[in-house]
């Protein structure tokens, strides 16, 4: 059958700073040339789009300039990475694959990477 | 709140030509695919065409391929279907429709009736 | 292309009982992606149903999705008199997206 399966990890801890990366692996039921990937963050059942990206494959994910998301692709891998998390961002991050070209269009989605954010101690005061 | 809004439909002969339109508001237009969804008079639903985000992407149904021509001006938030060499059979009341977050149809419009008849 | 078949044809029942629908699949593997979709006459369709089994928002949850491979299934627990409608299924995970021929649920 053709169908586009999606995996990435069930859980990943932000660091310290801020950043949390995963990888986003697809099974392509064609030979695509074009795939956008979409990062989504599911919370209290409410869905937002993270971060976008269309890449040509073969050639770099390119995210716009103001977007919190960096990321590699490597054949159907891609290597996603989200900065300046806070704690508050902590939820299920999900990653949208489509097949944009050529015909036919495919999509998939995976079942999500829980992300945990831990907001940092702030340093105590310290005399010298 | 989020909408999408359907216009002009009409009367028009087999052979002739005709623009519908489809207006968004209330969502980042430019982020979603949009498409052409159609229902002939007690009919089922028909899938007739999609455009996505940058409009660079589109894809149609076999029965209006090389007649229908789907196309979107972002900044002006509006989907467009450009319909050629129309025929009976595509009598029907047209829908545009977004494709939400994980891909389903999750807002539609009211419709637009489009007539082919002599 | 993926064709959806869908029984009954009509389903004749009272506010109340119980309403299963069932949509069938000429391939597997779009399960991930199967809609359900609510029509009234005049009214454009309303999504009830994606991914098989995730309710819409707004959706009361009387209105449940299952299934796998090539079998789905829409369920209403407990029809309520704004319940009777067309139901379609529709599989979006691959052009062309194609939906079943719909099953009439009215009042017996």
């Known amino acids: 059958c053709k169908a586009m399966h999606v995996a990435q990890p069930a859980v990943v801890l932000a660091s310290s700073r801020g950043i949390a990366s995963f990888v986003c692996e697809y099974a392509s039921p064609g030979k695509a040339t074009e795939v956008r990937v979409t990062v989504l963050r599911q919370a209290d059942s409410q869905v937002t789009e993270v971060c976008a990206a269309t890449y040509m494959m073969g050639n770099e994910l390119t995210f716009l300039d103001d977007s919190i998301c960096t990321g590699t692709s490597s054949g159907n891998q891609v290597n996603l990475t989200i900065q300046g998390l806070r704690a508050m961002d902590t939820g299920l991050y999900i990653c949208k694959v489509e097949l944009m070209y050529p015909p036919p269009y495919y999509l998939g989605i995976g079942n999500g990477t829980q992300i945990y954010v831990i907001d940092p101690e702030p340093c105590p005061d310290s005399d010298f | 709140q989020v909408q999408l809004v359907e216009s002009g439909g009409g009367v028009v002969q087999p052979g002739r030509s005709l623009r519908i339109s489809c207006a968004a508001s209330?969502?980042?237009?430019?982020?979603?695919?949009i498409h052409w969804v159609r229902q002939a008079p007690g009919k089922g639903l028909q899938w007739v065409a999609v455009?996505?985000?940058?409009?660079?992407?589109?894809y149609y149904a076999d029965s209006v391929k090389g007649r229908f021509t789907i196309s979107r001006d972002n900044s002006k938030n509006t989907l467009y279907l450009q319909m050629n060499s129309l025929r009976a059979e595509d009598t029907a009341v047209y829908y545009c429709s977004r494709s939400g977050s994980f891909g389903a149809f999750d807002i539609w419009g009211q419709g637009t009736m489009v007539t082919v008849s002599s | 292309e993926i064709v959806l078949t869908q029984s009954p044809g009509t389903l004749s029942l009272s506010p109340g009982d119980r309403a299963t629908l069932s949509c069938r699949a000429s391939?597997?593997?779009?399960?991930?992606?199967l809609a359900w979709y609510q029509q009234k006459p005049g009214q454009a369709p309303r999504l009830l149903i994606y991914?098989?089994?995730s309710r819409a928002t707004g959706i009361p949850d009387r209105f449940s999705g299952s299934g796998s491979g090539t079998d789905f299934t829409l369920t209403i627990s407990r029809l309520e008199p704004e319940d009777f409608a067309v139901y379609y299924c529709q599989q979006y995970g691959t052009s062309p997206f194609t939906s079943g021929p719909g099953t009439k649920v009215d009042i017996k």
């Open positions: 455009i996505w985000y940058d409009g660079r992407n589109k």
């Open positions: 991914g098989a089994s």
């Open positions: 391939q597997s593997g779009s399960s991930s992606y």
């Open positions: 209330g969502f980042t237009f430019s982020s979603y695919g």
